[in-house]
């Protein structure tokens, strides 16, 4: 008999290499037999994990699986670190492994801006 | 020295369709995404689409069905395409060039905008 | 959506008077913009991510806020700030703005 019992299927160690400035989605693999799970996402700061607050997301729902998604409109250098999702499934905290984001800034060293070039170039 | 200009047809009939064209100079189109704000005196301003460097797009989901955002890296341009225009289609029409810095993201440098106006 | 609401919608003030306007949104925020537009002009970005003057904005400018609740902050009217000032967020697709407030000057 299969279990019923909430699912996250992020494997151990994964990765991803993205680059800021453009968009990507973060998807958490969320297996669950009859009620949907309330599933969040939190970054690591140290040992502790901070919950996402105002951030985007959504689900995508497949035939055998669902995806609980983290939306980044667009990738900013802040994004780099690890994240984990975690599921409240009948007054149970489960918990995904973690998945790292490197984030790599397109913007590069000729083209980033001096101090002075950053504030007046939000004049039009 | 960062630039953006619109070129709009002004005046397009009911039914039609609209397509607007964004030429930018002073920065790469394949590093910083370009959006498409208008700008109505019924619904203020309007969030339409972007183009992400990378070349992915991202609509207002309530025009979306109507909207076709697409780009040209080497001519520096983009393109805005909406089908089915209406009389509230009525607005100046402004392409937007997006930057972020290390913790937020922000709409900088504004094109001097094109007026459309729905007519027959 | 999130829905940003904008008050006052016109608001008249004498130079040297402080301004504060506001801006809630109707579900919470990372950060918030502002834009200062005049007619036929397009807009211009004036504070971004809540705090932050854009260049040649004068220091009696200010903005402040979390969650749902900012505000931006003139310390002393002068006639040269007379403009529809928007706010925006960037925290959740559709990315809106408010419904202006009009600051005009006595």
């Known amino acids: 008999k299969e279990s019923c019992d909430v699912q996250l299927y992020i494997k151990r160690q994964s990765e991803h290499s993205i680059l800021a400035g453009d968009p990507f989605e973060l998807e958490c693999p969320v297996k669950y037999c009859a009620n949907r799970p309330h599933v969040t996402w939190c970054k690591l700061n140290g040992t502790t994990c901070v919950k996402l607050e105002d951030r985007q997301t959504s689900w995508k729902e497949e035939k055998n699986i669902s995806f609980f998604i983290l939306h980044f409109e667009p990738v900013l250098p802040n994004d780099n670190g690890s994240y984990r999702c975690s599921a409240n499934f009948q007054r149970n905290l489960i918990e995904s492994h973690s998945t790292t984001l490197y984030v790599t800034d397109v913007k590069s060293a000729s083209e980033r801006p001096s101090k002075d070039e950053m504030a007046s170039r939000f004049w039009a | 020295q960062v630039q953006l200009k619109e070129s709009g047809p002004g005046l397009v009939a009911p039914s039609q369709s609209l397509s607007i064209t964004c030429t930018v100079s002073g920065f790469s189109l394949t590093t910083y995404g370009v959006h498409w704000v208008r700008q109505s005196p019924g619904k203020g301003l309007e969030w339409l689409g972007v183009?992400?460097?990378?070349?992915?797009?991202s609509y207002n989901p309530a025009p979306m069905s109507r909207l076709s955002i697409s780009k040209d890296n080497s001519k520096s341009q983009v393109f805005l395409k909406m089908n089915s225009l209406q009389t509230d289609d009525t607005a100046m029409y402004y392409c937007?060039?997006?930057?972020?810095?290390?913790?937020?993201?922000?709409?900088?440098?504004w094109g001097q905008g094109t007026s459309v106006t729905v007519s027959s | 959506q999130i829905v940003l609401s904008q008050s006052p919608a016109i608001l008249s003030a004498s130079p040297g008077e402080k301004v504060t306007m506001t801006c809630r949104a109707s579900?919470?925020?990372?950060?918030m913009h502002w834009y200062q537009q005049k007619p036929g002009s397009s807009p211009k970005p004036w504070i971004y991510?809540?705090?932050n003057l854009a260049s040649g904005v004068p220091a009696r400018f200010s903005g402040s806020g979390s969650g749902t609740s900012y505000s931006l902050t003139i310390s002393r009217m002068e006639a040269e700030d007379a403009a529809t000032y928007y706010c925006h967020q960037w925290s959740s697709n559709p990315y809106t703005f408010g419904g202006g407030t009009k600051l005009e000057i006595k």
């Open positions: 183009m992400w460097p990378g070349g992915r797009t």
């Open positions: 937007v060039r997006g930057d972020y810095e290390y913790d937020y993201y922000a709409m900088d440098y």
């Open positions: 991510a809540t705090s």
């Open positions: 579900s919470s925020v990372s950060y």
